[in-house]
Interface confidence: low
């Protein structure tokens, strides 16, 4: 008779990843010994909440618990049940209700004791729901995207750790409520904010870091929407032939739009405004949003926030890759290079609501928007975060590595659970040739 | 250097109210929280609360709440303090402290690195 | 709200002699800070995040710890150590304060 072997045991932890405008929960796994190998941590599986994002019940704070239920029995069925009580549990809101935190203190402390409330009913190691820095948003981004790519350090054939040559890629997130830019960087910092130095592995990394709050797409859209009614009687972003009824209360209840804010208006009242297909006044528009006026430091991206020049190659995950991919894959246009982002970006917004609902059948609720959102990632990235040609080719449009998404999620668990060490294992690892 | 420089002693009546304030200078003045933290005699240290100069939002601890009213005038780089309704037990020794920070793991670690030199606030009839 | 209880209450050493102060949190905190207050003086940021030593701060003050117990360690106390030293969370909201330790020089 034959020993079999049985499978390494497998530990599992839960990110909640409470963005702005929905909930997703991510469960990982990984081999229990083989805790400290980089990209071995991966994606067991993934629920996404239904209805808005925990800061949309301000008015109803165990409402944004409550909603959490559904992912968390789905939580209960794929963690063995054996495994619950070890499995780590923690809740990470992002830019959402770092907004809620500016305007409302109060609800956004209401939100996070009624989803503690709830998290602590569950049979998981739950250690805290908080609300994520910007900072913290794009230093986990940039983590989880280098670990899954396995770029901090490699495990050779002859049982030696070592660090591989290729560098570390950059990270670019756009969110809902915020964007983040994250690059390792040998600039020295003007602005120690925007710095942080990492160390792991055993590897010292200097990273740039900075989120722009209010620059992601949701709160863009809402920002170019409250310009539109500021400045036309249309929205130039807008396909010609779309039209709807927009609500005041709703567009400038954002701390995002209060530049656009009327002194005296009507929450209540509801506007009607149509589209023109007209991509140039929406090129405009969009950069009406980026202000270069100023720069107290050597160099800036925009609004006066220190940035080194971009270096190295990136990976442009959440919107910015859906963005895109609706480029390449819905509309069949090349993205290949900045020259063909833009004349994408153009192409849609010349598009008629007849001919975009041609195009892309079934795709309705967020239609009107890709000639904003194409127009805004190709600013951004152009004029905002300073890539040229060159520098845009090293640039990949990808929302998993490794069949995990790429987020601060993942990041944020590995480093609150301990899972990258700051010192690099032994020097010689055991080599198993069976 | 980075200075934060409080206004001198106040005595006043019970009931009364008393507006302290706190210059700052030496660094940019709406890139840190100003916090403000109480101590009476023989007491231990006690958080009062804080405000974000760049959006005007403050935050109190709950103890404190209604009876100190945090402001900033961002022209002059000055933080303000307004306690109301003050009795016996207000009397202290109040401090501004600017809220710097670390970053680890992009982790904002927040902590007080400057700090007033005090203003004593005696409540006396 | 957390509370944080540090000991001894008071403390008295000799120059050159290694010391240990205490501070003891209700409940588990991420990290802790230590401030150092000399008579008629505000306090002064002496540690921040439980091990960092602030700018200007001599090499002979160290901190150590996690979860709900830490220390501040003088590795050879000087006279001008005489003062309250305050440990302090900024872990769960309200921020709060230890009672403080007083040392005194002897």
């Known amino acids: 008779t034959r020993d079999i072997r049985e499978p390494p045991a497998l530990k599992y932890g839960i990110v909640l990843d409470a963005g702005s405008s929905h909930t997703s929960m991510f469960i990982y796994k990984w081999p229990a010994d083989k805790e400290n190998d980089t990209g071995i941590v991966g994606q067991h599986s993934s629920c996404d909440v239904p209805g808005g994002g925990i800061s949309s019940y301000a008015d109803n704070p165990s409402g944004a618990g409550q909603s959490l239920v559904g992912c968390l029995e789905q939580a209960l069925r794929d963690v063995p049940k054996e495994r619950h009580a070890g499995t780590p549990l923690y809740l990470g809101a992002t830019a959402g209700m770092r907004l809620l935190n500016l305007t409302n203190p109060e609800a956004s402390t209401s939100v996070l004791t009624a989803v503690t409330h709830t998290l602590t009913q569950y049979p998981f190691d739950f250690r805290g729901a908080r609300i994520l820095s910007g900072q913290e948003e794009g230093v986990f981004g940039w983590v989880t995207a280098n670990y899954l790519l396995e770029n901090f350090i490699k495990y050779g054939w002859v049982g030696r750790w070592f660090r591989p040559r290729k560098g570390t890629l950059g990270a670019m997130d756009l969110g809902g409520a915020s964007t983040q830019i994250t690059f390792e960087t040998t600039s020295p910092a003007e602005d120690r904010a925007s710095e942080v130095q990492l160390r792991l592995y055993g590897q010292h990394y200097r990273v740039y870091t900075h989120s722009f709050l209010c620059y992601g797409r949701d709160q863009v859209l809402q920002r170019l929407l409250a310009s539109a009614l500021q400045t036309h009687s249309f929205h130039p972003c807008w396909p010609r032939g779309f039209s709807t009824h927009v609500l005041l209360g709703d567009v400038y209840q954002s701390p995002c739009t209060v530049a656009q804010r009327p002194q005296t208006f009507n929450s209540s009242a509801r506007v009607s405004l149509s589209g023109s297909s007209d991509p140039h006044l929406c090129r405009d528009l969009v950069s009406g949003l980026f202000s270069f006026s100023s720069c107290p430091f050597s160099r800036c991206s925009f609004n006066g926030v220190f940035q080194p020049p971009v270096a190295g190659n990136f990976i442009a995950f959440s919107a910015f890759f859906y963005t895109v991919n609706f480029l390449r894959t819905s509309m069949g246009l090349p993205v290949a290079t900045l020259q063909q982002l833009e004349a994408a970006a153009v192409n849609v917004c010349n598009q008629t609501w007849a001919q975009l609902q041609a195009r892309v059948p079934g795709q309705q609720a967020h239609l009107a928007d890709y000639c904003a959102g194409a127009m805004f990632v190709q600013q951004l990235l152009s004029r905002g975060y300073g890539f040229d040609e060159r520098a845009f080719g090293g640039v990949i449009f990808q929302k998993k590595a490794a069949d995990t998404a790429v987020g601060w999620a993942l990041g944020y668990m590995l480093n609150l659970t301990n899972l990258i060490p700051a010192d690099p294992p032994g020097l010689r690892k055991g080599t198993d040739f069976s | 250097q980075v200075q934060l420089v409080q206004s001198g002693a106040e005595v006043v009546k019970p009931g009364a109210s008393v507006k302290i304030s706190c210059k700052a200078s030496?660094?940019?003045?709406?890139?840190?929280?100003m916090d403000w933290v109480k101590q009476a005699p023989g007491q231990r240290l006690e958080w009062i609360g804080d405000i974000n100069p760049k959006y005007d939002i403050s935050t109190y601890n709950q103890q404190f709440k209604g009876k100190a009213t945090i402001t900033v005038d961002t022209s002059a780089s000055t933080a303000y303090m307004e306690l109301s309704s003050l009795r016996s037990e207000d009397t202290a020794v109040y401090y501004c402290?600017?809220?710097?920070?670390?970053?680890?793991?992009?982790?904002?670690?927040?902590?007080?690195?400057?700090w007033g030199q005090g203003t004593l606030v005696t409540v006396s009839s | 709200e957390i509370v944080l209880t540090q000991s001894p209450a008071t403390l008295s050493a000799s120059p050159g002699e290694r010391i240990t102060l205490s501070c003891s949190a209700s409940?588990?905190?991420?990290?802790i800070h230590w401030y150092q207050q000399k008579p008629g003086q505000a306090p002064r940021l002496l540690i921040y995040?439980?091990?960092n030593l602030a700018s200007g701060i001599p090499a002979r003050f160290s901190g150590s710890g996690s979860g709900t117990f830490y220390t501040l360690t003088i590795s050879s106390v000087e006279p001008e150590d005489a003062a309250v030293y305050y440990c302090h969370q900024w872990s769960s909201y309200p921020w709060t304060f230890g009672g403080g330790t007083k040392l005194e020089i002897k």
């Open positions: 402290a600017r809220r710097g920070f670390f970053l680890y793991y992009g982790i904002n670690y927040y902590y007080f690195d400057v």
């Open positions: 409940s588990s905190v991420s990290y």
């Open positions: 030496g660094y940019t003045f709406t890139d840190y929280n």
């Open positions: 995040s439980t091990s």
